[in-house]
């Protein structure tokens, strides 16, 4: 299907009647683009199709072609004065010069990136104008998931094990499904996080916590919703008896939750044998995923922080087997898994997860439009909450507590510190009056921030302009009536005085009185006209 559109100017909103008139006078150029989004894989080339119908005798010298980003009007590529003006978009765009004369204004976008996703407008001007927008949907397949176990050895039936399914470099965000060996979906105790890298591609990490039976198979499916591509992996766990001799290192099973800017303690302990001295201890804290050193203690000495000087041990407690790490001024970037590695004579290690969180601010509510509202008007309510982590869940409801799910658009944007600003937009048709509440929930802190707005739709009264016209005319009417009364009073007084002078004079006064009253009557009717207009 092609979408056809002719537009009387570039992004200019003309009043309906005026626009229609302009259209009739000039005739718009019909520009055709695909109705469905163009799906392009990251790193490949994409063609954004756009065509127009050239009239007989058309030459490229007459053509003015502009490709631009619909939302920002940023120039992407242009053709003017019979010449390709080249790419204004990272030198990754090209036209099809040999096809332009036949009305093919398509754009080739090379080495597609996630940041390219969005709407591109093809604007064609010959004598008339026409434009249409085409959507680019970027996609990248997810890698085959890798599965990791924690703990990954000495597993016994009844142990709780954390299975992590990780899939990398996909776009857009994935859907993750878990199931057991019998194909039964596993939905409880699943935590899925998706983190975008610098290129905007997502790494998805889904964590399933299960209690081991005799043995079991666990499968993870990562689905790309745009490509409808499924990537599977599974792991079979067979618990076994544990060998002896290793240092038993204990860490909390659940993630340590820390607020941004506060200090967090990553607990880790071991059981020192009798006669143990710190000179024998080799303690290393490192990032589980990269082995990057965080903090170490060797040769009976604290070797200090290798992690932005924000870590510390508890030296007085080490001899008792407390190898915990204090992480100061926690940042979003600290989130992840830290391994506590203890070596005395034997070795032992365990990983502890740090979950970073930040509360969301009380939502602020804005209305658009925010005045002259009447029942039946469509109003846009925006609920904004700032500097939270991780991404929020947003819920809308009306005054009766009924959830509002339709016509809601929520966007979340991370700042340089990784904290999210959430903006949720609700579009509603006003009733006589109504209350609309927005709830922003931090899923980790289970903290809810509320905001609400009550809108009272005004009855169908005059608009303020009409009100002032009415008041003005009323004042004029009163003034005229006062003037009329004054004139009448003068005339009556005058006729009374002249009555004594004779009948002839009285007739003349009657005529004069009639003449005097005539324009007043005219003015009166004029005022009536004014009231009707108002």
């Amino acid at each position: 299907m092609l979408r056809r559109r002719g537009s009387p100017g570039m992004g200019v909103h003309v009043g309906a009647a005026l626009g229609a008139l302009w259209f009739c006078l000039t005739g718009a150029l019909e520009v055709q683009v695909p109705e469905d989004p163009v799906v392009a894989l990251v790193g490949t080339d994409a063609t954004l199709c756009c065509s127009f119908s050239p009239e007989p005798g058309f030459s490229l010298a007459q053509l003015n072609l502009i490709w631009q980003l619909t939302d920002t009007k940023q120039l992407v590529h242009s053709f003017a004065e019979g010449q390709d003006q080249g790419s204004a978009y990272a030198n990754r765009t090209a036209l099809f010069p040999d096809l332009l004369a036949q009305g093919n204004a398509s754009l080739r976008l090379q080495r597609v990136r996630v940041a390219d996703e969005g709407s591109f407008t093809c604007f064609v001007s010959i004598r008339d104008f026409g434009s249409a927008a085409v959507s680019l949907q970027v996609a990248a397949p997810y890698s085959k998931p890798s599965m990791t176990l924690e703990p990954n050895k000495d597993l016994r039936p009844g142990d709780t094990v954390t299975i992590t399914c990780s899939s990398y470099q996909g776009y857009p965000e994935a859907e993750v499904f878990w199931q057991d060996g019998q194909g039964v979906p596993l939905t409880g105790n699943v935590t899925t996080s998706q983190m975008a890298n610098e290129q905007g591609l997502f790494d998805v990490h889904s964590i399933l916590r299960v209690v081991l039976g005799a043995n079991g198979t666990y499968s993870c499916l990562v689905r790309n919703p745009v490509l409808q591509q499924d990537a599977h992996s599974s792991v079979t766990i067979t618990p076994q008896r544990s060998p002896t001799g290793a240092v038993e290192v204990q860490v909390p099973e659940d993630p340590v939750v820390a607020l941004v800017g506060t200090d967090a303690t990553l607990r880790c302990s071991f059981s020192p044998e009798p006669g143990f001295s710190l000179a024998q201890l080799n303690l290393i804290w490192q990032l589980t995923d990269t082995k990057q050193l965080v903090h170490s203690f060797t040769e009976g000495r604290d070797q200090g922080s290798a992690y932005a000087n924000r870590t510390a041990l508890f030296p007085d407690l080490l001899a008792q087997g407390n190898a915990s790490l204090r992480l100061q001024r926690v940042r979003v970037a600290d989130e992840g898994s830290f391994t506590c590695f203890v070596s005395i004579r034997d070795f032992g290690s365990a990983a502890v997860s740090l979950q970073v969180a930040a509360p969301y601010s009380k939502p602020s509510m804005t209305l658009e439009p925010n005045k002259d509202l009447r029942p039946g008007d469509t109003v846009t309510i925006t609920c904004s909450s700032y500097r939270g982590y991780p991404e929020a869940e947003v819920f809308w409801q009306d005054g009766q507590g009924v959830p509002l799910t339709g016509n809601v658009t929520t966007s979340q944007m991370a700042n340089e510190q990784g904290l999210f600003d959430v903006h949720s937009v609700l579009r509603v048709v006003l009733g006589a009056n109504g209350t609309y509440s927005c709830l922003v929930r931090n899923p980790v802190l289970q903290q809810d921030a509320h905001g609400s707005v009550t809108i009272t739709g005004q009855p169908m009264t005059f608009p303020p302009e009409a009100l002032w016209v009415t008041v003005g005319l009323s004042v004029c009417l009163i003034a005229l009536l006062v003037a009329l009364a004054f004139v009448c009073w003068r005339k009556i007084k005058q006729s009374c005085e002249e009555e004594n002078a004779g009948a002839e004079d009285q007739d003349g006064e009657g005529e004069g009185s009639k003449t005097a009253l005539q324009p007043l009557k005219h003015s009166d009717s004029k005022e009536d006209d004014g009231q009707e207009i108002a």
Epitope: S146, I284, T290, K291, F341, S343, R345
Partner: antibody, heavy 118, light 109 residues
């Protein structure tokens, strides 16, 4: 029995490419970091590359950075080393080794020979 | 030149005690596990010692110790089958790389 078995070594011309594989068995492959280590004829051991259990982190020796790529397929219990732009000095026996949590390369394969010569 | 320094050769007579040293820095041996590997002629390296831990199957004639940024491997009651190349190795935090010693060729006279 815990075992690592390398394959893919052969004679290749300078500038050519080769892909080595290492098949793991007898342990939970997806739980371990893995490494490639090489030994040139008559020389000592030289570490080449390492990869995390999930494949998300990779490390390389300066001598191979930009030319070699380490990867793994946990579903197939297999480690790979893609070698491009091969040079004469890459001639060696290539071993894959299991890298455990305690920073010990505790299990080694028997090695596969790569000869780069015109 | 290797990051870890080992003597190129060592020798001893059967029954004797031989020590091989390995010197590194605070970013490797100083804080990470030091591993010793034995490579018999024509075979793959085999883990001998980690710090002072012996894997099962390694005779107790082999022992390891570590002090500061140095480590040593001691072999007591030297036997002819101990004739091999011995390498020390450790993960290095600064280089984000495994580092090996140049190897010590042990000859049993």
């Amino acid at each position: 029995e815990v075992q690592l078995l390398e394959s893919g070594g052969s004679l290749v011309q300078p500038g050519g490419s080769l892909r080595l594989s290492c098949a793991a068995s007898g342990f939970t492959f997806s739980s371990y970091w893995m490494s490639w280590v090489r030994q040139a004829p008559g020389k000592g051991l030289e570490w080449v590359s390492g990869i995390s259990s999930s494949g998300s982190a990779t490390y390389y020796a300066d001598s191979v950075k930009g030319r070699f790529t380490i990867s793994r397929d946990n579903s197939k219990n297999t480690l790979y080393l893609q070698m491009n732009s091969l040079r004469a000095e890459d001639t060696a026996v290539y071993y894959c080794a299991r890298w455990n949590d305690y920073d010990i390369m505790d299990v080694w394969g028997q090695g596969t020979t790569v000869t780069v010569s015109s | 030149q290797s990051v870890l320094t080992q003597p190129p050769s060592a020798s001893g007579t059967p029954g004797q005690r031989v020590t091989i040293s390995c010197s590194g820095s605070s970013s490797n041996i100083g804080r990470r596990t030091v591993n010793w590997y034995q490579q018999l002629p024509g075979t793959a390296p085999k883990l001998l010692i980690s710090n002072s831990q012996r894997p099962s199957g390694v005779p107790d004639r082999f022992s390891g110790s570590k002090s500061g940024t140095s480590a040593s491997l001691a072999i007591t009651g030297l036997q002819s089958e101990d004739e091999a190349d011995y390498y020390c190795a450790s993960w290095d935090d600064s280089l984000n790389a495994w580092v090996f010693g140049g190897g010590t060729k042990l000859t049993v006279l």
